[in-house]
Structure formats: C-alpha cells, structure tokens
Amino acid sequence: QHHGVTKCNITCSKMTSKIPVALLIHYQQNQASCGKRAIILETRQHRLFCADPKEQWVKDAMQHLDRQAAALTRNGGTFEKQIGEVKPRTTPAAGGMDESVVLEPEATGESSSLEPTPSSQEAQRALGTSPELPTGVTGSSGTRLPPTPKAQDGGPVGTELFRVPPVSTAATWQSSAPHQPGPSLWAEAKTSEAPSTQDPSTQASTASSPAPEENAPSEGQRVWGQGQSPRPENSLEREEMGPVPAHTDAFQDWGPGSMAHVSVVPVSSEGTPSREPVASGSWTPKAEEPIHATMDPQRLGVLITPVPDAQAATRRQ
C-alpha cells in the first residue's frame, strides 16, 4: 500500500520564534520534496511549530532532544527517530499545528476518533479562531506524549500549526526526543486525586507516562513574553471551547498573515475537539481573524469556536 512517503505532506510557510527546549518533546524534519527545509517541533502540549533549521536555537534544541533520546535508549527505552519521512500511523495523537504548516493528505490513512487529553495549560493561552482538525500527527513510537501542564505549550502560539484532535492521520510523527509524562493521546492521563506517597519513579507511571519524564518541563505556556497577568479561571476558559490559535505578545512574528493550509484525509468519525483553557495574556485576541485552512469543514468535522472577548483572555483574575 502506498503511503505517500515521498510526498511532501507537511510544508511550512512561516517559522516560529524561539521556544524553550524544556517545552519540546520531539522534532521531525520535513521531507526533501517539500523544497523549503524546516524542522517541525512538537511541544509537550502536542502543538506543532515550524522552525528554521538554520537558526542556532533550533540546532541547539535538536541536539538537546537527541541527547535525551539517546539517554532514553540507554535506559532501556526505545525511541524512534526518522528524518525526512512521514508515514501513516494508526496511533491516535493530538497535536496543534503552526499556522504556517500545511499537512497534505496521503494516499491512505484511516482515522479513529479519540477524545484527546491535552494539557490544559497549552490551550489555556491560546486564543483566536483556529479550527481543530480531526486529524493529527501521531506521536513517535506510540509512546505517550508529555503532559501539557500549563494551559498552553510553550511555543509561539501565533505560529502554531492547528491543534489537532487525537485522531490518527495519514501523517506520522517521528519523534526524536523522549516523551514526557503528561496527558497525551496515547494514554489516558491519570491524575492523582489524592496525595500519594509513592516514589517518584513510580509516580510517573501513576501519571500514565510510559516514558521517563524528561524534556518538556512545564508546559503552560503563558503567552510568550507575558508578565504576571491574571490566569483565566472560569467559563470562558478554553475548557469550554475548542482550541483556537493563540496570538501572543511573545510571538509577534506570527499573525493573521501566517496561515495553515491543512489538507487531510477525511476521517471516518469526527474526532472530538480537545478542550483547552482559554489563552490569556496582555494581547488582544483577534476575534475576526478568519480561519485559514484549505479544507472542507463538513468533511473534516472542523470545530470552529468563538473567541472570548479580550477581558476573558486575562490569565488569572
């Protein structure tokens, strides 16, 4: 069966600004057939961002993730790292895509709808009007993706590829870094409701994180470059809405101009959009910003959610 391995299925029109490697879980290089080379970074919030491989911070981040992956392998874990090739995988994964990323459909690819369990932190800061696609880039090695502690992943929110619900897509995410513990589409995240006294080594398993907690530290991505703004606390939080692209101060280089053209294989059953907290920050959400995506909303079951007013965007009141 042809999976369109050589076809360019992820293209980038705009590169993200810097993201702490602590918030990243793995990366992937796009295919040579894409022409413009780019590194696709995934944050622990399962958001995807296009990054310029020539930038020093990107080189350092990849090197750091490679070291982590090597350490994980040495510790008995397995880690899959593939460059320049994206294969379909059936493992569901939730992820967001930078607005500058384009996912091209592959020849085949069945989708299964799963309820994503993204870390709210990542979504918490995301504001905007970006559709959530029922397709996602799957995590590498089927290992559970790291948690997304804070409402949003650390990453230029504005440049993020659309955040995708955890339905398997034709694109496979090749990971080059260990997955962090935390909610992921691969494993149902468990939360210790009551304090536990178990040892840290077992604690991770309590959190349903098969891989060692590493890399992607905190995931709450406040709005990049934001001060002590209040955190959203109630109904307007993203938890009540589908994810939308966040445009934050910190990532001024992204804006309405950068768009994600996502062409994906229709899914058999629509994926339930992940719920994430509303992004907050000192920035003003662009409520009228159009959804930039080349897709048929009906066919993809795209969730278009309203953007809360700017006041609702404050991080914590």
């Epitope: 810097k18 702490p20 490697v21 602590a22 918030l23 020093q56 911070w57 350092d60 750091h64 870390s119 709210s120 932190q121 990542e122 918490q124 800061r125 948690p147 997304t148 502690p149 804070k150 409402a151 949003q152 992943d153 650390g154 990453g155 929110v157 513990p181 935390g182 909610p183 995240a189 468990k190 939360t191 604690q203 991770a204 309590t206 959190a207 349903s208 907690e213 590493e214 530290p217 905190s218 995931e219 709450g220 991505q221 406040r222 990049w224 470059g225 934001q226 001060g227 002590q228 209040p230 955190r231 959203p232 109630n234 939080e237 938890e239 934050t248 910190a250 992004a279 991080r315 914590r316």
Partner: antibody, heavy 119, light 107 residues
Framework: QVQLVQSGAEVKKPGASVKVSCKAS????????IHWVKQAPGQGLEWIGW????????KFNERFKGRTTLTADKSTNTAYMLLSSLRSEDTAVYFC????????????WGQGTTVTVSS | DIQMTQSPSSLSASVGDRVTITCRAS??????LAWYQQKPGKAPKLLIY???TLADGVPSRFSGSGSGTDYTLTISSLQPEDFATYFC?????????FGGGTKVEIK
C-alpha cells in the same frame, strides 16, 4: 487573585518523612504546572521539579529523584510534596510556585514552608 | 545541566546609584532568562522574564539585557525598597537552574 498558600513549618527527625501542601486559588488549578523550589539556609534557589495537576504527571530534577514525591489533588486544588528519609541537608524553606505556559519562570509563589530536620 | 554564575555575590550601593548584576550561563540559554528579587523571609518576586520583559507592576528602573550566555540586570536608580537579593534563572532547559544570588546592601 492568584494565591498559593503553603502549610506551616515542620520539625522532623532524620529518617522521617514530611508532606508539604500548597493550596492554589484564583485560577484553574489543572491548567498550570506547580513547581517546587528549595532554599537552604543562607543559600540560593534549587528547582526540585514540577507536577501537572491536570494529569498528575511529575518531572524531577535528577538531584531530587528518589526521596521526593509530587502529587496533586484536583478536588481541593492542592499540590503536595512528600520528602522521605529526611536528612539534615533537607533543612530548608520549600516554595511552591507556578508560571505561565510560554516558559517555566515563576510569577506566583507560595509563602514558603520551613522544614527543619534535627535529631 | 546548565550552570548559572551570578556576580557579584554582594555589593554595597547608595540610593540613586546605578546597579548592574550579571549572570553567566554555562551554555546558550537563548534569552530564556528570568530575574527575581527576594527579601528576607519572603518568597522571590518575578522582575523580568525572557531576558528583558518586565513583569507586571515592576518599575521601569529595572531592565534586563543580554544574549547567548551573558545577561545583565540593571537598576538605573536604586531606591530604598530595592535593597534585597537578586537571582537569575534559566528556563531554556531542565533542570531549571538559578544563579547564586547577589545581595544588594546599603552603603
């Protein structure tokens, strides 16, 4: 407003365990990481690790793995740090803190809990 | 792990003085640096993050600069309430690390 309120001072004997709590209010607890930071007497700050209340997953500084357990109770919006097999060098002020989602710097801190380990 | 070396460890200054504290990382932290102020018996208070962004409510006399491995916190005109200990923290990679602190005392 956002607040992190920690439990009171503790005096323990070597080998014992202590559980420090950090109650959060003013924001959605499950959306932000809670970090723990140690400050020994007259010393600097050391990051112990974080827990993501949303799913209970922890991450540790290797230096603190083994005797430290981080948990969170979503029903009470409280994070806990359990220190076991206490030693004299564990005597310090322990802070819980939380930060934004774009990076792990800490904009809100608890008032600190002093843990004294002495025989 | 990235080590953070802060200097000086202490300094004496007078109200109105311009004070500069430096922080050097053992590796490139790509501007992911925060500065905190701590007073005796209190929790640290965030002053600056992302190398130069002022946290909410922080007076404009505080400023941050730097890149790569070298960063600076400057207090343009020291005020009585600024006598405290200052720490830098890198949040580029885990484990997050802090500088040893700089105690600013009254001359």
């Amino acid at each position: 407003q956002v607040q992190l309120v920690q439990s009171g001072a503790e005096v323990k004997k070597p080998g014992a365990s202590v559980k420090v709590s950090c109650k959060a209010s003013g924001y959605t607890f499950t959306n932000y990481y809670i970090h723990w930071v140690k400050q020994a007497p007259g010393q600097g700050l050391e990051w112990i690790g974080w827990i993501y209340p949303g799913d209970g997953s922890p991450k540790f500084n290797e230096r603190f793995k083994g005797r430290t357990t981080l948990t969170a109770d979503k029903s009470t919006n409280t994070a806990y740090m359990l220190l076991s097999s206490l030693r004299s060098e564990d005597t310090a002020v322990y802070f819980c803190a939380t930060g934004p989602t774009d990076g792990d710097y800490f904009d809100y801190w608890g008032q600190g809990t002093t843990v004294t380990v002495s025989s | 792990d990235i080590q953070m070396t802060q200097s000086p460890s202490s300094l004496s200054a007078s109200v109105g003085d311009r004070v500069t504290i430096t922080c050097r990382a053992s590796g490139n932290i790509h501007n992911f640096l925060a500065w905190y102020q701590q007073k005796p018996g209190k929790a640290p208070k965030l002053l600056i993050y992302n190398e130069k962004t002022l946290a909410d409510g922080v007076p404009s006399r505080f400023s941050g600069s730097g890149s790569g491995t070298d960063y600076t916190l400057t207090i343009s005109s020291l005020q009585p309430e600024d006598f405290a200990t200052y720490f830098c923290q890198q949040f580029w990679s885990t484990p997050y690390t802090f500088g040893g602190g700089t105690k600013v005392e009254i001359k």
